[in-house]
């Protein structure tokens, strides 16, 4: 699995999306877990509703929410009031019995400032990046335009 990088700003909300094949994963509940180490377990943070038909209902655990569009095939995780300690390696999972399939590996990065990024000082709009081997950055930062700036369509 490739790793997708989602970047958010401390104190703001970050939305992580995990697309999947809705037919292949029909009837399966989903989960969001945090990888604790290279070989360690993936610690469950939150999972979708116990009744698969109600997966569209948002479920919260603390400041993390999960909701599943089972027809469209998109699992969405919201991290509210993002803090530095939320940074880490996570997985979107599809559950079947006691087994779990990885839908997506997600690296969450928490920026101190909307303009913090890989190349200090330049104005940066998030989008895909090919500068690291097996990861790409998802558009995930929202910020207000500065006075006089021209709106710029997000890349994806």
């Amino acid at each position: 699995h490739n790793t997708t990088v989602f970047q958010g700003v401390a104190g703001q909300s970050l939305q992580v999306s995990c697309p999947y094949d809705s037919m292949k994963h029909w009837g399966r509940r989903k989960a969001w877990c945090r990888q604790l180490g290279e070989k360690g377990p993936c610690q469950r943070v939150v999972s979708t509703h116990n009744l698969w038909l109600l997966s569209f209902l948002r479920r919260w655990n603390g400041s993390t929410a999960i909701t599943d569009d089972t027809l469209g095939g998109t699992l969405t995780i919201t991290l509210r009031n993002l803090q530095p300690h939320d940074a880490g390696l996570y997985q979107c999972q599809s559950l079947h019995g006691s087994e779990a399939d990885t839908l997506r590996k997600v690296l969450v990065e928490v920026l101190a400032d909307p303009l913090d990024h890989r190349d200090a000082g330049d104005l940066w709009f998030p989008g895909e990046s090919e500068s690291f081997e097996d990861a790409h950055v998802e558009h995930s930062i929202s910020r207000s335009l500065l006075e006089g700036e021209i709106p710029f369509p997000p890349t994806s």
């Epitope: 401390a10 603390g62 530095p84 880490g88 690296l107 913090d116 990024h117 890989r118 500068s131 690291f132």
Partner: antibody
Framework: EVQLQQSGPVLVKPGASLKMSCRAS????????VHWVKQSHGKSLEWIGL????????SYNQRFKGKATLTVDKSSSTAYMEVNSLTSEDSAVYYC??????????????WGQGTLVTVSA | DIVMTQSPSSLSVSAGEKVTMSCKSS????????????LAWYQQKPGQPPKLLIY???TRESGVPDRFTGSGSGTDFTLTISSVQAEDLAVYYC?????????FGGGTKLEIK
């Protein structure tokens, strides 16, 4: 054994720039963030910023924005901090430290021995 | 920025005595989402880099002797050394591990009589 080996002490002139290094060993370099911390003589600790070696993403303490620039070289498992426009206020010991949390920024679990920087004409 | 205030700035005790030092933060370090306190304690011996002792306000880092105990929640925290040893001579710093920028207290210098 996790080790962070920092470059040696330096004496630099005011107005100059300096790039110090922190070579990591004993773990997978890209799995943990690297932080930089300043300690002026006899004073407390100040967090400068961090870098995620996997992506190169940085976050800075606003106080050090424009003063410090953090980079990494993954091929040599080395983190760097460049400090510019040096003044006597920049004279200090600078530490690199590795986070405790896998792919996370939390906690300074392992520290380098520090690089002593003296700014003097 | 979260301001960390430590007291006392220094204290001198005899070996075997119990010691407590305080750390107060200008904002709560308790995360309401998971009910964890993001407060760490470090020990810095003369001529050495700091060493992580306690994280999460009360969890000892592996290898740290059990005479070191962290407690507290929200904005008020305490580091206790139940029976001070000669090798505990050091400066102790608390650190905000909750939000950027990470900030440290001014330190408490522990001297052994």
């Amino acid at each position: 054994e996790v080790q962070l080996q920092q470059s040696g002490p330096v004496l630099v002139k005011p107005g100059a720039s300096l790039k110090m290094s922190c070579r990591a060993s004993g773990y997978t370099f890209t799995d943990y963030y690297v932080h930089w911390v300043k300690q002026s003589h006899g004073k407390s600790l100040e967090w400068i910023g961090l870098i995620n070696p996997y992506t190169g993403t940085t976050s800075y303490n606003q106080r050090f924005k424009g003063k410090a620039t953090l980079t990494v070289d993954k091929s040599s498992s080395t983190a760097y901090m460049e400090v510019n426009s040096l003044t006597s206020e920049d004279s200090a010991v600078y530490y690199c430290a590795r986070s405790r949390v896998y792919y996370g920024s939390s906690l300074f679990a392992f520290w380098g021995q520090g690089t002593l920087v003296t700014v003097s004409a | 920025d979260i301001v960390m205030t430590q007291s006392p700035s220094s204290l001198s005790v005899s070996a075997g005595e119990k010691v407590t030092m305080s750390c107060k933060s200008s904002q709560s370090l308790l995360n309401s989402g998971n009910q964890k306190n993001y407060l760490a304690w470090y020990q810095q011996k003369p001529g050495q880099p700091p060493k992580l002792l306690i994280y999460g306000a009360s969890t000892r880092e592996s290898g740290v002797p059990d005479r070191f105990t962290g407690s507290g929640s929200g904005t008020d925290f305490t580091l206790t050394i139940s029976s001070v040893q000669a090798e505990d001579l050091a400066v102790y710093y608390c650190q905000n591990d909750h939000s950027y920028p990470y900030t440290f207290g001014g330190g408490t210098k522990l001297e052994i009589k």
